[in-house]
């Protein structure tokens, strides 16, 4: 309950708030959990604590880990945990699932996209906004304070939006980017960037050698009839058929279902007579539609035999 996930990109600023709240007068101590080492408060350090905030200016991949914050008052102490992950910058345009903030929905009447976490930073307008890596241009887009307004929203406006701004700390500038998906609500139905429900990203599935195994790729695409939506499996990044292993087959056709009113599809990958070499493969569940493609990777591991010793 009092643990919070935070993430950022290397060489960008990242500011994390302690998940335990307290009055401004309370002191907050920060520690790096693995070593129990205290985080300094001096601003000359690249990573330093500033009351409720933990600042990485800029962040490095090696900063990843769990940080403990203790809010101290005259009568009690409250402990919180910040699970921080710093990722390497992607060379391509795709924003991976793990860098995405919560999805927001808009409609023709209300199409505000707030820049995630921006209130933690010392920034000045204007914000820069990008959709699928392209800078947003044209009179339909208005950067207003900490949010983007889109006029005359259409279903094609759904996608991944990135805000970019500069955090200023004692005269030094640091870049920050944050991305979230935007979906368009429409009475007739709408389409959104695929959301994979299963498998989880980098899931490890336990299988028994010699037995059959099934993997299900399941994703949702929006409401109503979906255009160009599909789920499929790939092996080591190639088509199942190109891989040429007859024991591993994708089911013909995909099953349609509905979850919370959303149109979802699933596709089963069947592995007959699981072999040791199957554990070395990368199984990719792909969900795609007109907005783009999302990929979750699964690997297999050997299920340990049940220990019968007392």
């Amino acid at each position: 309950k009092f643990s919070k996930q935070s993430w950022g990109l290397e060489n960008e600023a990242l500011i994390v708030r302690c998940p335990r709240q307290g009055k401004p007068s309370y002191t907050v101590d920060w520690y790096y959990s693995q070593t129990n080492k205290s985080i300094p408060t001096q601003e000359r350090n690249r990573v330093f604590a500033s009351g409720q905030l933990l600042k990485f200016l800029p962040a490095a991949v090696a900063d990843s880990g769990i940080y403990t914050c203790i809010v101290r008052s005259p009568t009690f102490n409250r402990t919180g945990y910040a699970n921080v992950t710093i990722y390497k910058k992607q060379s391509d345009c795709n924003v991976p699932d793990y860098l995405m903030y919560s999805t927001v929905s808009g409609s023709e009447k209300n199409s505000k996209i707030y820049c995630p976490t921006i209130d933690l930073y010392n920034w000045t307008a204007p914000l820069e906004w990008f959709k699928n890596c392209q800078a947003l241009q044209g009179s339909r887009y208005r950067a207003h304070k900490s949010f983007l307004v889109i006029d005359n929203v259409m279903t094609e406006d759904a996608g991944d939006y990135t805000c970019k701004f500069i955090h200023n700390e004692n005269g030094a500038n640091y870049s920050v980017t944050a991305t979230r998906s935007f979906t368009v609500k429409d009475e007739q139905g709408f389409s959104l960037f695929p959301v994979i429900g299963a498998p989880a990203q980098n899931e490890i599935k336990e299988v028994e050698i010699g037995k059959n195994a099934n993997l299900t790729c399941s994703a949702c695409f929006g409401k109503g009839t979906q255009f160009l939506a599909a789920v499929l499996w790939q092996l080591n990044g190639t088509k199942i058929t190109d891989f040429g292993e007859p024991r591993i087959q994708q089911e013909e056709g995909q099953n349609q279902s509905f979850s919370n009113g959303l149109a979802c599809l699933d596709m089963v990958l069947r592995i007959a007579d699981v072999k040791e070499e199957d554990l070395l493969l990368q199984y990719d569940c792909l969900a795609l539609n007109l907005h783009g493609l999302r990929r979750h990777t699964v690997r297999l591991s050997r299920k340990n035999p049940i220990d019968h010793h007392s």
Partner: antibody, heavy 121, light 107 residues
């Protein structure tokens, strides 16, 4: 090895019909969509339509609607394309091309060798 | 119907050259674009699917990029066997349509 083998060349008179076959081997026949694409001499590629061998459903380009019929025979892993009311401008090489599901993502990755159809009086 | 316009319609290049072919769609087609190579008297061969994915068995000197309406096929270092005609094709909306082709000739 996935292969598509088409029937031999045809010479037809204007107004006649031609039926070209495309036999698939090396994969699950019903697991691949089959397109028909033609190429007139010295010209580019033109899509005619698609058949899903699994259910037999078809989609034809408007230009060929009413003149083209695509069918399949799952027992012999063969798809057929019949074009009726032939005219001289139908002279072309006709290709069958396979696409794995979903065809709009994967493109046409297996092609037959082509069947030359000549329409001449 | 969605129109696909390729440019140039032909080009002359030497072995080792970097070659770029562009394809423009008359409307947004997302990333549902494929590239093919065709040699005289032969069937086309798929090189790139979904705008940027390299088809299995195709040399890595071929690459594709772009989304929306503008797409590019790049051959990083032209080889003797690459002299052929190249076509783009959209699969966003039936009828599927091809570009007019780009003939790559020996300089």
């Amino acid at each position: 090895q996935v292969q598509l083998v088409q029937s031999g060349a045809e010479v037809k008179k204007p107004g006649a019909s031609v039926k070209v076959s495309c036999k698939a081997s090396g994969y699950t026949f019903t697991g691949q969509y089959m397109h028909w694409v033609r190429q007139a001499p010295g010209q580019g590629l033109e899509w005619m339509g698609i058949i899903n061998p699994s259910g037999g459903s078809t989609s034809y380009a408007q230009k060929f609607q009413g003149r083209v019929t695509m069918t399949r025979d799952t027992s012999t892993s063969t798809v057929y394309m019949e074009l009726s009311s032939l005219r001289s401008e139908d002279t072309a090489v006709y290709y069958c091309a396979g696409s794995y599901y979903p065809y709009y993502y994967y493109g046409m990755d297996v092609w037959g060798q082509g069947t030359t159809v000549t329409v001449s009086s | 119907d969605i129109q696909m316009t390729q440019s140039p319609s032909s080009l002359s290049a030497s072995v080792g050259d970097r070659v770029t072919i562009t394809c423009r769609a008359s409307q947004n087609i997302g990333y549902f674009l494929h590239w093919y190579q065709q040699k005289p008297g032969k069937a086309p061969k798929l090189l790139i699917y979904a705008a940027s994915s390299l088809q299995s068995g195709v040399p890595s000197r071929f690459s594709g990029s772009g989304s929306g309406t503008d797409f590019t096929l790049t051959i990083s270092s032209l080889q003797p066997e690459d002299f052929a005609t190249y076509y783009c094709q959209q699969s966003y909306s039936p009828p599927l349509t091809f570009g007019g082709g780009t003939k790559v000739e020996i300089k």
